[in-house]
């Protein structure tokens, strides 16, 4: 259950990290590893973490995984999991992070930080 006045700082930190990764990408991110694409909606940080956790030995996204863990420390219960957990398409990590950045910016602008 969200607190009445959530902090935007952690979301802002995530956005800054995603900007840093996606803008400074010189070579294929995480050796071109593929992750499950998601409809990044209600539990998007949890869904994003569930997808990225499969990537090991890629230090570039270590901080991103930590930040997602901070935003979603507890796994959503089954009754709260919806379409964003449907796994049908894999995309490259770089594209996944760009999608995550885009949705995070929308949430930040809307002020619904949780």
């Amino acid at each position: 259950s969200p607190n009445p006045v959530p902090s935007s700082s952690s979301l802002k930190e995530l956005i800054e990290e995603l900007v840093n990764i996606t803008q400074n990408q010189k070579v294929p991110l995480c050796n071109g590893s593929m992750v499950w694409s998601l409809n990044l909606t209600s539990s998007m940080y949890c869904a994003a973490l569930d997808s990225l956790i499969s990537i090991s030995n890629c230090s570039v996204i270590h901080r991103t995984k930590r930040m997602l863990s901070a935003l979603c420390p507890h796994k959503p219960s089954a009754k709260h999991v919806s379409s964003e957990y449907v796994r049908d398409t894999k995309i490259e990590v770089a594209q996944f992070l760009k999608d995550l950045l885009r949705h995070s910016r929308i949430i930040f602008r809307n002020g619904s930080y949780n």
């Epitope: 969200p2 607190n3 952690s10 930590r66 949780n114």
Partner: antibody
Framework: EVQLVESGGGLVQPGGSLRLSCAAS????????MSWVRQAPGKGLEWVAS???????YYPDSVKGRFTISRDNAKNSLYLQMNSLRAEDTAVYYC????????????WGQGTLVTVSS | DIQMTQSPSSLSASVGDRVTITCKAS??????????MHWYQQKPGKAPKLLIY???NLESGVPSRFSGSGSGTDFTLTISSLQPEDFATYYC?????????FGGGTKVEIK
């Protein structure tokens, strides 16, 4: 060095209230989720409450509605407000940095003892 | 709630022994192929310390004599060669479903 220091424990009567505090240092407090875990004397560990970096809170049914976890990022502090205390709430309460469901409770404080007795 | 059953509840061993502790969950704690099971060590009067996360990943700074294995409902913590500082109580914990639950603990004592 990560440090978590709990305070606020003590003796309280059944039905009473107590507020525990945890002072965090050695890491960027705002960037981590935090939790409280308790341990009754001579017993095992029990998760009590968690709070995400964004302010979402999580509780087991045993304390829901009686305990409230909160954080003050400006003060690098975590709190646990405990109301309607019962004898079975007697325990050492640990503050822990929660690195998420994939990573567990990475760091723990030394604990503060709460005794609920008349 | 997911019940965590540890065995044995206590054991006596000597320095240099190989020690195995098991933890059984009442239902699977796997999430997308990752086991949300963690192991902690607690010494008397001290706070718990994370040893293993996600069933088999060694926490930074933890000696390599500690290892974890398992998936689904059955998990094992192994100490390959018991050292004097390893005499303590060990707990497993699942984070796959709220409420997060711990095993009852296994006390490792000196023989």
């Amino acid at each position: 060095e990560v440090q978590l220091v709990e305070s606020g424990g003590g003796l309280v009567q059944p039905g009473g209230s107590l507020r525990l505090s945890c002072a965090a240092s050695g890491f960027t407090f705002i960037s981590y989720a935090m939790s409280w875990v308790r341990q009754a004397p001579g017993k095992g560990l029990e998760w009590v409450a968690s709070i995400s970096s964004g302010g979402n809170t999580y509780y087991p049914d045993s304390v829901k509605g009686r305990f409230t976890i909160s954080r003050d990022n400006a003060k690098n502090s975590l709190y646990l407000q405990m109301n309607s205390l019962r004898a079975e709430d007697t325990a050492v309460y640990y503050c822990a940095r929660l690195d998420g469901y994939y990573f567990g409770f990475a760091y723990w404080g030394q604990g503060t003892l709460v005794t609920v007795s008349s | 709630d997911i019940q965590m059953t540890q065995s044995p509840s206590s054991l006596s061993a000597s320095v240099g022994d190989r020690v195995t502790i098991t933890c059984k969950a009442s239902e699977s704690v796997d999430n997308y192929g990752k086991s949300l099971m963690h192991w902690y060590q607690q010494k008397p009067g001290k706070a718990p310390k994370l040893l293993i996360y996600r069933a088999s990943n060694l926490e930074s700074g933890v000696p390599s004599r500690f290892s974890g294995s398992g998936s689904g409902t059955d998990f094992t913590l192994t100490i390959s060669s018991l050292q004097p500082e390893d005499f303590a109580t060990y707990y497993c914990q699942q984070s796959n479903e709220d409420p997060w639950t711990f095993g009852g603990g296994t006390k490792v004592e000196i023989k």
